[in-house]
Every structure is written in structure tokens, then in C-alpha cells.
């Protein structure tokens, strides 16, 4: 079984030292010195800052929650998939 | 081809600032992260932050906070970074890279750095 | 925020040698990434997520590791191979990226 846990919004701090929103807009054709669009890579967090954020579990991106969450593998649980059920 | 082009040295008095300029070419800011890297001499590399192009959304070490900003301008295809109140600590070449990859992104491109001297 | 340490500092061999290095984080990440650094250059892109080889990266090169221990190795050392290599990864949250402080690779 896969437990998905709760959904977490990557941070919004919008100061004008610092702005810490990990939230992907979505992206407009074409674009000065764009690329072929085939071979773009749409950006989620979880292939960049959120790499190693799931530790015993899976990222997702939920793209319209503009949020990640982790899908835990069995036996974990917990926001980040980091703790093991006594069972 | 894929390259980041970075603006000349700078030599700074204490308590200046300054800006450093990455331009990107053969691809799109917008479709990446772009980050800033310090490294001083004869040390180790340091991770300042990194701008989202698409939204301008940033993100700092929390050393650098106060100290570094990270703009970006899409229409020019650019990231700069800006350093303030400099003083010898800053002493250092700035890089700028761009994070990308297949399924698990990494600093695929890096600019040539820009050598930033602070001295009266 | 998780430290990465490299060991060791420095790494001396010989021609022809096999060689390992260490990153250690200070807990379990899922992806580590490894850049060369030759003095007077930018660093490049070596190793990225564990074991894949960057562009034009020789094959005598692999990475390999799991949860807080990773590592590079060299199976026959050659004389381009000597400078200082860096492993990097994303933790905590909000994410924050570091380095480990490098090993440098010189030949004998």
C-alpha cells in the first residue's frame, strides 16, 4: 500500500530581500532564445529543490495546488515520509 | 549552444556595491532555475541563491541574506547579482549556473565567474 | 540545513590507480551530484544524480551511494583527472543547497 501525506506549499515569504516561493507559473509559448519546445522540461520542484525533500517516498507535484506532497512507501508516514509505523 | 556569458572582474572600495551580470544564450531563462555560486580564493564553493525567471521568485542562503540580491530579466535573457556594503570577505569569483537536468536536476551550465577584488 | 562532508581533504595517487571518495551527509538524502574544478576554471558538471555521467565525463569515472553515504570512484587515475571534485545536494525545508568542502586529486 502507498500512503500519500498531507500536501505541503512550498514557502511564500515575498519581502523584497527575500521571496522564497518555489511555485512554478505556468509558462507561455515561445520565448526569446527559447528552445525547440520538444524539448523542454516542464519545471516541477520535485525534479529540483525538492530532490531529496520525500525520504522514504516519492515527490509529487500537484501543479494545480501549485504544492508537493509525498507518497510514502509502506511502512512510513509522516509530512516528509520520515517515519516508520510500529507494526 | 548552450552558454552563460558573465560580466567583467570588479574592483570595489569597502563599503561599495556592486552588480555582476550573467546573460544566457541558446535557451530560455524562464525554463530554469539560475543560481549564484562564491568561491574565495583557494576555498571551497558557496551557494549564495537562486532566482525563478518565470516568477522572480527567490531564494537565499541565509548567510547571504541582506548581503546578496538576485534579479532577473527575462526580455534580456538575464540574471544579475548584486553584492552590498563589500567588504575583503567578498573577495572572491562569482559564478552563475544554470540548474536543469533530465528527471533530477544539477548545475548542467556555468558561466566562466566573474572575480569581484575589495580594496581601498 | 545537512552538511556534507568529503573525505578525504586530499587524495594523492599514482597513474594507473584505482580511487575512491567519500560524501557524507549529515542525514539521508536521495540524490547526491559531483562537479570537477581544475584551478583557474569553472567548475563542471561530473556525476548527477548518484551515478549518471555528465556529458563527455570518461567512463573510468562512476558514482555510487544511498541514504547519508555516497561516493566517487576512479578505476584507472589518469593525469587530466587531478583537481578538486565537489559533491552537492538539496535538504531540508525549505530546501537549501550546499557543497561539501572538496577533494583534491593529485598524481604522483
Known amino acids: 500500500s502507498v500512503r500519500v501525506e498531507q500536501v505541503v506549499k512550498p514557502p511564500q515569504n515575498k519581502t523584497e530581500s527575500e521571496n522564497t516561493s518555489d511555485k512554478p507559473k505556468r509558462k507561455k509559448k515561445g520565448g526569446k532564445n527559447g528552445k525547440n519546445r520538444r524539448n523542454r522540461k516542464k519545471k516541477n520542484p520535485c525534479n529540483a529543490e525538492f530532490q531529496n525533500f520525500c525520504i522514504h517516498g516519492e515527490c509529487k507535484y500537484i501543479e494545480h495546488l501549485e504544492a508537493v506532497t509525498c507518497k510514502c512507501q509502506q511502512e512510513y508516514f509522516g509530512e516528509r515520509c520520515g517515519e516508520k509505523s510500529m507494526k | 549552444e548552450v552558454q552563460l556569458q558573465q560580466s567583467g572582474a570588479e574592483l570595489v572600495k569597502p563599503g561599495a556595491s556592486v552588480k555582476l551580470s550573467c546573460t544566457a544564450s541558446?535557451?530560455?531563462?524562464?525554463?530554469?532555475?539560475m543560481h549564484w555560486v562564491k568561491q574565495r580564493p583557494e576555498q571551497g564553493l558557496e551557494w549564495i541563491g537562486r532566482?525563478?525567471?518565470?516568477?522572480?521568485?527567490?531564494k537565499y542562503d541565509p548567510k547571504f541574506q541582506g548581503k546578496a540580491t538576485i534579479t532577473a530579466d527575462t526580455s534580456s535573457n538575464t540574471a544579475d547579482l548584486h553584492l552590498s556594503s563589500l567588504t575583503s570577505e567578498d573577495t572572491a569569483v562569482y559564478y552563475c549556473?544554470?540548474?536543469?537536468?533530465?528527471?533530477?536536476?544539477?548545475?548542467?551550465?556555468w558561466g566562466a565567474g566573474t572575480t569581484v577584488t575589495v580594496s581601498s | 540545513q545537512i552538511v556534507l562532508t568529503q573525505s578525504p581533504a586530499i587524495l594523492s595517487a599514482s597513474p594507473g590507480e584505482k580511487v575512491t571518495m567519500t560524501c557524507r551527509a549529515g542525514?539521508?538524502?536521495?540524490?547526491i551530484h559531483w562537479y570537477q574544478q581544475k584551478p583557474g576554471s569553472s567548475p563542471k558538471p561530473w556525476i548527477y544524480?548518484?551515478?549518471n555521467l555528465a556529458s563527455g565525463v570518461p567512463a573510468r569515472f562512476s558514482g555510487s551511494g544511498s541514504g547519508t553515504s555516497y561516493s566517487l570512484t576512479i578505476s584507472r587515475v589518469e593525469a587530466e583527472d587531478a583537481a578538486t571534485y565537489y559533491c552537492?545536494?538539496?535538504?531540508?525545508?525549505?530546501?537549501?543547497?550546499?557543497f561539501g568542502a572538496g577533494t583534491k586529486l593529485e598524481l604522483k
Open positions: 532566482i525563478d525567471p518565470a516568477n522572480r521568485s527567490t
Open positions: 541558446g535557451f530560455n531563462i524562464k525554463d530554469t532555475y
Open positions: 552537492q545536494q538539496w535538504s531540508g525545508y525549505p530546501p537549501m543547497l550546499t
Open positions: 549556473a544554470r540548474l536543469y537536468g533530465d528527471s533530477v536536476w544539477y548545475f548542467d551550465v
Open positions: 542525514s539521508s538524502v536521495n540524490y
Open positions: 544524480a548518484t551515478s
